[in-house]
């Protein structure tokens, strides 16, 4: 009896794993084996496919074959018993085009109200993605184990932190990789669950801001309690995309180690030009807070984007605010040669309820104020360039009383 050649051959490539699956043509014939040959583009001869010779099952793995993943190859299969079937040729394919991105590896670290997610490619030193390793972006789905309501987070890098979670709560998540340059979306990782910790008695420092004074950077933050010590760490921002890099390590700012105030001052030459991440941690000697939210700090912008200077003209029901160029040390105005947008925050002196105005103009009216009432105002500048999305720190607050009624003209 003539053996029929196998049919419906499928090539599955996930990362560097090359798997072939096929259907037997004749289930009634026992003890049949299968063998594959492959042929590279531009070659006439067929070569035995190692790992896929005399296979008794309907699946084989040819991952050990060192192929150029960008080069088209052709496969053929036949069945063998005493005699052999005719060859069945599989449509030619390019491994890279066919390949799927495998599930990434995920490591989670729990805080009380946050989870730190470390993601790395599932296949270390992958040949398939050797040229694209740094282009991976990731997306994840996270849910509270108790509710199952999913939240999706797109376009994250190898390290991501999710804030504003509840203490002592189990969260589950799964992550997949994407290579947007090649229009490839990967396979989800297994589900990872982690329980956030009990609430830390020491909250993380908040509202971290960097400003420039003379030749120094001044880093300030807010903290709930007194008699604390703080430490500040920095990281090159670009490393967030590549924690595999041996430089990926948060480092201490020497002048900000064990400081007893909610600010520290360090020379500008501590940082070369670049974009950095900064974080702060508090300690009372026994306990330690979790790390603060990270702030992005661009030395280029920081040196120039100073808080605006403004004057207030008070009326009974409004303020007119005139914004001028910020002053450097020596009282000389700073020339800022990129367009700015101004954020003005104002509030009644006796209240915490803040209101916000965003304006491109340098003369701004704050309307709907009450007569004979003290209002406070602070302002900051933002760059309008999308690529250079930077902000100054807020100016010091200026408080003024509105005039008595009927003076709005």
């Amino acid at each position: 009896k003539n053996l029929k050649s196998p049919q419906k051959v499928e090539v599955d490539i996930i990362d560097d794993n090359f798997i072939l699956r096929w259907n037997r043509s004749d289930e009634s014939v026992g003890n049949v084996t299968f063998s594959f040959d492959y042929q590279k583009t531009g070659m006439d001869n067929w070569i035995k496919l190692s790992g896929c010779q005399n296979i008794t099952s309907t699946k084989c793995n040819f991952s050990s074959l060192k192929l150029n993943v960008y080069e088209e190859i052709k496969l053929r299969i036949r069945a063998e018993k005493e005699n052999t079937s005719s060859w069945y040729e599989v449509d030619s394919f390019t491994p890279f085009r066919k390949a799927q991105i495998g599930p990434p590896e995920v490591h989670l670290e729990a805080e009380d109200k946050a989870i730190v997610i470390h993601i790395s490619p599932g296949t270390k030193d992958s040949v398939m993605w050797a040229l694209d390793g740094l282009s991976f972006t990731y997306s994840l789905v996270i849910w509270k184990n108790s509710s199952g309501v999913e939240e999706r987070i797109e376009n994250i890098y190898s390290r991501h932190k999710i804030y504003k979670l509840s203490p002592e709560t189990t969260y589950c998540l799964k992550v997949k990789a994407a290579l947007l340059t090649s229009w490839k979306i990967g396979v989800y990782s297994p589900v990872h669950c982690i329980k956030t910790t009990v609430e830390n008695e020491l909250p993380p420092p908040e509202n971290i801001e960097v400003s420039v004074q003379n030749q120094n950077y001044v880093l300030k933050w807010d903290y709930t309690y007194a008699n604390m010590t703080f430490q500040v760490q920095w990281l090159h921002a670009f490393l967030k995309r590549n924690p595999g890099n041996h430089l990926y390590k948060w480092k201490q700012i020497p002048d900000c180690e064990n400081v007893k105030t909610t600010q520290c001052v360090f020379p500008q030459n501590v940082f070369q030009k670049g974009i950095y991440l900064l974080r702060v941690q508090a300690s009372d000697g026994n306990n330690t807070s979790f790390w603060s939210e990270e702030i992005k700090f661009d030395t280029e912008i920081q040196a120039f984007l100073l808080p605006p200077v403004f004057n207030i003209r008070s009326l009974s029901d409004s303020f007119h605010i005139y914004i001028g160029a910020p002053k450097q040390s020596g009282n000389t105005p700073v020339i800022q040669d990129y367009p700015l947008i101004y954020e003005i925050i104002f509030w009644e002196n006796t209240s915490n309820a803040e209101r916000k105005i965003i304006e491109k103009k340098t003369d701004v009216t704050v309307p709907n104020l009450k007569p004979l009432t003290v209002y406070c105002v602070k302002a900051r500048a933002h760059t309008m360039d999308e690529k250079l999305n930077k902000s100054s720190v807020f100016s010091d607050a200026v408080c003024e009383k509105t005039k008595p009624g009927n003076t709005s003209k």
Epitope: E109, H246, Y248, W291
Partner: antibody, heavy 123, light 107 residues
Framework: QVQLQQPGAELVKPGAPVKLSCKAS????????MNWVRQRPGRGLEWIGK????????HFNQKFRDKATLTVDKSSTTAYIQLSSLTSEDSAVYYC????????????????WGQGTSVTVSS | DILMTQSSSSFSVSLGDRVTITCKSS??????LAWFQQKPGNAPRLLIS???TLESGFPSRFSGSGSGKDYTLSITSLQIEDVSTYYC?????????FGSGTKLEVK
Amino acid sequence: QVQLQQPGAELVKPGAPVKLSCKASGYTFTSYWMNWVRQRPGRGLEWIGKIDPSDSETHFNQKFRDKATLTVDKSSTTAYIQLSSLTSEDSAVYYCARGGRISFDYDAALDYWGQGTSVTVSS
Amino acid sequence: DILMTQSSSSFSVSLGDRVTITCKSSEVIYNRLAWFQQKPGNAPRLLISGATTLESGFPSRFSGSGSGKDYTLSITSLQIEDVSTYYCQQYWNKPFTFGSGTKLEVK
């Protein structure tokens, strides 16, 4: 697979120093903290300190700051602990143990351990 | 330094028993707790990390629980190969500190 290889035993005279080695393989040596732990006969475990093999940053248990020096040789993926001015109190098994990834925000558990080097201080 | 206190230094147990070993820290350690199993003449072996995550290679009869300052290692049905000394260790604050160990002995 991850392996940490340590020599079995060292006999040292009182007052002399000793340098113990820990040869790491099966992982990227510079990506993980390397820790050292002491266990005296019939006693519990004491953490000595840890070193970042990529830049040799060290953290010590204050108790061992004057006793131990931690170093690495990246080319041979080997970590070392040098113990100075040994006394009979320093007789113990010294373990190296891999810690968390250096890129982690917080410390992690010691997941792989060497078999330990037994140091005997005797004249 | 954070002090780690293990409930008892030794336990006399029967095979098949449910065993519970407790570990208390002097400060909150936010689940940064590991359990190690050590057999005579061998290095400690990481059994549980993050207070609850069982390391691969260990059977599911082992489990870890707890939070804040109080943590527990449980063995549902003790087998002969589980007879060892168990240590807890905190890795929240440096210096990392270990409990004094709990030795399981068969009755």
